[in-house]
Amino acid sequence: MSKGEELFTGVVPILVELDGDVNGHKFSVSGEGEGDATYGKLTLKFICTTGKLPVPWPTLVTTFSYGVQCFSRYPDHMKQHDFFKSAMPEGYVQERTIFFKDDGNYKTRAEVKFEGDTLVNRIELKGIDFKEDGNILGHKLEYNYNSHNVYIMADKQKNGIKVNFKIRHNIEDGSVQLADHYQQNTPIGDGPVLLPDNHYLSTQSALSKDPNEKRDHMVLLEFVTAAGITHGMDELYK
């Protein structure tokens, strides 16, 4: 068990803060909830603190919850591949470039670390080149979320990881908006981190609303499990 992994044995409170600017539309989002890495479970509620969110909530899911991949469930035989927990409590910088097919792109930078007993994800987001009547600024996405696989590889040069995945957003007309994600994670601290073999995270997300919440918001339930590395031969002969 890495030193960082010991911090995730129980339920951990989560705080998310985002400052965004998409095509000049500025906004802020605050999120609160909790994570339980034993089950790879996240429950979070996000509120746009600046009024109406200028982009559809589903386009921010990866920035919020795929931001705290330290809550992913890594099975026992894969724990030595869990970069995310090993970087704690100092945390990691997580950066992404996200291209929305035939539309604009997001660039994000987040610092994910413990502040006291709380896991905090502080994010800056910049969106450019979006069409005002496109699927994103035109709010044509359905309020739901598909399951995805998130592919992880070591980046020894940066003492971190590179990640790639393609998100499929459902559009109201029945078609799909693709979003290509390019991600890099680097540790904030100088301590040793686990550099993984290639593997993936399997994610399932459910979006809902709080019937008592008047502000523009999103409620998110997510399960994330690491996979893609089989038991070694030594496991077979135990």
Partner: antibody
Framework: EVQLVESGGGLVQPGGSLRLSCAAS????????IHWVRQAPGKGLEWVAS????????SYADSVKGRFTISADTSKNTAYLQMNSLRAEDTAVYYC?????????????WGQGTLVTVSS | DIQMTQSPSSLSASVGDRVTITCRAS??????VAWYQQKPGKAPKLLIY???SLYSGVPSRFSGSRSGTDFTLTISSLQPEDFATYYC????????FGQGTKVEIK
């Protein structure tokens, strides 16, 4: 050893076309972004276009959008810049450069450059 | 587009001098700023990335810092091989470069 080698530059008339190539060695372009940056004679650096070959995601400077197309062939580990409807103001040395996947990476390796001259 | 206003456009200095070049972004660019050195007829070379991270193999006399939307490249003790043109570059929006600063021998 990481290397980027540009080719395809030359003299072309206004309205004409050229295709620049950027052959990469010593690394797999799929796991990086590739950028074209140009420098007009005696002037500063100007970004032209970028491609993320893993998913073929692209972006362009406003000055070339609709005229230039960036592409990549991962099997050949090569990026391309197709330049159409060339103008006199496109005259420059064109460099290809490698960067990481994210905004803070910086362009850590550059080619030697290839000169494009647009003149009648 | 995000503008990077670089100053000064040129400066004269002597070997051993401390040299400071600044870039101001027209809006927030997070830490997505890099600095390059270019010599005549050559391709640019990366010095600093992520506003303040020294690129591998670059001498430690080069450093970068950020204060909001102001970014600074400092050469603590100018060496003969440092006379060149320096550019800042942001990649938070569509990529843009500063106009360049030519460092000449006094």
């Amino acid at each position: 050893e990481v290397q980027l080698v540009e080719s395809g530059g030359g003299l072309v008339q206004p309205g004409g076309s050229l295709r620049l190539s950027c052959a990469a060695s010593g690394f797999n372009i799929s796991y990086y972004s590739i950028h074209w940056v140009r420098q007009a004679p005696g002037k500063g650096l100007e970004w032209v276009a970028s491609i993320y070959p893993y998913y073929s995601s692209t972006s362009y400077a406003d000055s070339v959008k609709g005229r230039f197309t960036i592409s990549a062939d991962t099997s050949k580990n090569t990026a391309y810049l197709q330049m159409n409807s060339l103008r006199a103001e496109d005259t420059a040395v064109y460099y290809c450069a490698r960067a990481g996947w994210v905004a803070s990476s910086g362009m850590d390796y550059w080619g030697q450059g290839t000169l494009v001259t647009v003149s009648s | 587009d995000i503008q990077m206003t670089q100053s000064p456009s040129s400066l004269s200095a002597s070997v051993g001098d401390r040299v400071t070049i600044t870039c101001r972004a027209s809006q927030s660019v997070s830490s997505a700023v890099a600095w390059y050195q270019q010599k005549p007829g050559k391709a640019p070379k990366l010095l600093i990335y992520s506003a303040s991270s020294l690129y591998s193999g670059v001498p430690s006399r080069f450093s970068g810092s950020r204060s909001g939307t102001d970014f600074t490249l400092t050469i603590s003790s100018l060496q003969p091989e440092d006379f060149a043109t320096y550019y800042c570059q942001q990649s938070w929006g569509l990529i843009t470069f500063g106009q360049g600063t030519k460092v000449e021998i006094k």
